[in-house]
């Protein structure tokens, strides 16, 4: 069983390497941004924009949203290609979990305050769902403060 | 050297059938999506089919949905495409080629291309 | 379906010269999916540049790209030899993945 276990973490690990988590990071901060734009924030405002070139550049996603983004533009391709990114981890719940843990890691630095990761976390959960795929069961999605790309 | 190797063209009759297969080397295979690309006689460029590393995902063009089925061995590194009730309108080059994306920021692409096997569809 | 429509059919420059093709989509297309080919007679396809600005391996750096959402251009600055070919754009985002018709950049 070990053996086993401990080829599945490694087919996993190969399997997360060969992943294109970016189009989910993409969907997810889109969708988080659009949620607080309805909700009476200024869409143009670059004081809030996680992405804002005001911010550290090296931070700055080239591919992320703009405001004119906002509006949905590109957002059902961030969701098709990463639907099919997490589609290749459908018969491996554990992986499927280290996959999601790793878009919030990777984006953990970009969320700005409590109520934008609690938001991130919350969408994220419900990623698989959207996808039409099993959601794993049991997946922590905390991450240390001061959390790092794993690309 | 990364290569890709296309097959299985030939002459055939409308509503006939051919398989073509791409074999490749010179990478690990089933790291990649996978995609047929084809050209009618002096035209563009049209996409036919993609197929993801584990075969999860396939998607056709509208042109070849229910005649065409696009699969992949990973064990012998290769891809194929069974081309059924084939049309006038089917004759062309048919490339396969690999896609990857860019690790840091996420773009896919076909970076890899084979020279194509040609499929000329005439009574 | 995204339809992606290439303009001018044909662009006749000469070398020195710059060139600029227009790539416009039937609806917004994220730059992360827009991708740029060169393809000579007899011969496959050449990535060219992926989401929408970045140059692949080995491109050099007269080739250049721009936009979002709905229009997209390359720019070549100054036109050698063997630049003179068809560039095609694609979208790669959402299924079916579509070409642009082409742009054939011929030498005048």
């Known amino acids: 069983r070990q053996q086993w276990e401990l080829q599945g973490d490694r087919r996993c690990q190969s399997q997360l390497e060969r992943a294109n988590l970016r189009p989910c990071e993409q969907h997810l901060m889109q969708k988080i941004q659009r949620d607080e734009d309805s909700y009476g924030r200024d869409p143009y405002s670059p004081s809030q924009d996680p992405y804002s070139p005001s911010q550290d550049p090296d931070r700055r996603d080239p591919y992320s949203p703009s405001p004119y983004d906002r509006r949905g533009a590109g957002s059902s391709q961030h969701q098709e290609r990463c639907c099919n990114e997490l589609n290749e981890f459908e018969n491996n719940q554990r992986c499927m979990c280290e996959a999601l843990q790793q878009i919030m890691e990777n984006q953990s630095d970009r969320l700005q305050g409590r109520q934008q990761e609690q938001q991130f976390k919350r969408e994220l959960r419900n990623l698989p769902q959207q996808c039409g795929l099993r959601a794993p069961q049991r997946c922590d999605l905390e991450v240390e403060s001061g959390g790092r790309d794993r690309y | 050297e990364v290569q890709l190797v296309e097959s299985g063209g030939g002459l055939v009759k409308p509503g006939g059938s051919l398989r073509l297969s791409c074999a490749a080397s010179?990478?690990?295979?089933?790291?990649?999506?996978m995609n047929w690309v084809r050209q009618a006689p002096g035209k563009g460029l049209e996409w036919v089919s993609s197929i993801t590393r584990s075969s999860r995902t396939i998607y056709y063009a509208d042109s070849v949905k229910g005649r065409f089925t696009i699969s992949r061995d990973n064990a012998k590194n290769s891809l194929h495409l069974q081309m059924n009730s084939l049309r006038d309108a089917d004759t062309a080059v048919y490339y396969c080629?690999?896609?990857?994306?860019?690790?840091?920021?996420?773009?896919?692409?076909?970076?890899?291309w084979g020279n194509g096997t040609t499929v000329i569809v005439s009574s | 379906e995204i339809v992606l429509t290439q303009s001018p059919g044909t662009l006749s420059l000469s070398p020195g010269e710059r060139a600029t093709l227009s790539c416009r989509a039937s609806q917004s297309v994220s730059n992360m999916f827009l991708v740029w080919y060169q393809q000579k007679p007899g011969q496959a396809p050449r990535l060219l540049m992926y989401g929408a600005s970045t140059r692949a391996t080995d491109i050099p750096d007269r080739f250049s790209g721009s936009g979002s959402g709905t229009d997209f251009t390359l720019t070549i600055s100054r036109l050698e030899p063997e630049d003179f070919a068809v560039y095609y754009c694609?979208?790669?985002?959402?299924?079916?993945?579509?070409f642009g018709q082409g742009t054939k950049l011929e030498i005048k």
């Open positions: 694609q979208q790669n985002g959402n299924s079916p993945y579509t």
């Open positions: 010179g990478f690990i295979f089933s790291d990649y999506n």
């Open positions: 080629a690999r896609e990857d994306f860019d690790v840091s920021t996420g773009p896919y692409y076909m970076d890899v």
